[in-house]
């Protein structure tokens, strides 16, 4: 058998390499598709998704979509290829280590989406950038 480090490259997007031919490890993401949520008016929420999946393609990142309409609130957690739009939107923040929610214009509902590229990063969805950037250790130093 020929190990992967000497295999000729094949036309298959299950294998992703950088410029030096290194293989990319796949992302681990929360993947519960669409579920009802109680997350509302909070700076951050946990997904409450118990399924962590190995993303099928190594280029995929973690995505979370929060939607609120007159009837309910849902949270969607998936893997997705950032080269492709999701819900008709580009994943602009796919390289971020944290899932920082950004509002998108959708008629008839409030729609937030985030994407990120660290393991299970779509488990903790953050609606406040201030919440994300504040450093508790720094505050401790300031107030001492």
């Amino acid at each position: 058998t020929i190990p992967p480090h000497v295999q000729k490259s094949v036309n298959n997007d299950m294998i992703v390499t950088d410029n030096n031919g290194a293989v990319k490890f796949p992302q681990l993401c929360k993947f519960c598709d669409v579920r009802f949520s109680t997350c509302d008016n909070q700076k951050s929420c946990m997904s409450n998704c118990s399924i962590t999946s190995i993303c099928e393609k190594p280029q995929e990142v973690c995505v979370a979509v929060w939607r609120k309409n007159d009837e309910n609130i849902t949270l969607e957690t998936v893997c997705h290829d950032p080269k492709l739009p999701y819900h008709d939107f580009i994943l602009e923040d796919a390289a971020s280590p944290k899932c920082i929610m950004k509002e998108k214009k959708k008629p008839g509902e409030t729609f937030f989406m985030c994407s990120c590229s660290s393991d299970e990063c779509n488990d903790n969805i953050i609606f406040s950038e201030e919440y994300n950037t504040s450093n508790p250790d720094l505050l401790l130093v300031i107030f001492q």
């Epitope: 992967p4 031919g21 290194a22 293989v23 190995i54």
Partner: nanobody, 124 residues
Framework: EVQLLESGGGLVQPGGSLRLSCAAS???????RMWWVRQAPGKGLEWVS?????????YYADSVKGRFTISRDNSKNTLYLQMNSLRAEDTAVYYC?????????????????WGQGTLVTVSS
């Protein structure tokens, strides 16, 4: 430097079982997330399953969920893959690989990160 050596592959009938092992030489086995990766003839790599070093939390590709079980014995520096209800589409060379915390890429030439592979053939 850790070297990885897989064993346990072979020919098995559809519906049968196999247990793969991956022995790691070296003392840093417990620092790494370990993976089973497979490559079918003419196809790309498929990341089958992973297991954390501490707590032994496990992850599976949808294609093997409910059929394959990954485990590790840190005292023996060994990774395992129990494969049940095998199908023809599970035919591949199976590799073990290791991933350090926050590591996103692994060089294909790094023999200390990849095993040489063991061939699993599922056929009647």
């Amino acid at each position: 430097e850790v070297q990885l050596l897989e064993s346990g592959g072979g020919l098995v009938q559809p519906g049968g079982s196999l247990r793969l092992s991956c022995a790691a030489s070296g003392s840093t086995f417990t620092e790494y997330r370990m993976w089973w990766v497979r490559q079918a003839p003419g196809k790309g790599l498929e990341w089958v399953s992973a297991i954390e070093p501490i707590g032994h939390r496990t992850y599976y590709a949808d294609s093997v969920k409910g059929r394959f079980t990954i485990s590790r014995d840190n005292s023996k520096n060994t990774l395992y893959l129990q494969m049940n209800s095998l199908r023809a589409e599970d035919t591949a060379v199976y590799y073990c690989a290791k991933q350090a915390p926050n590591q996103r890429y692994v060089a294909r030439g790094r023999l200390d990160y990849w095993g040489q592979g063991t061939l699993v053939t599922v056929s009647s």
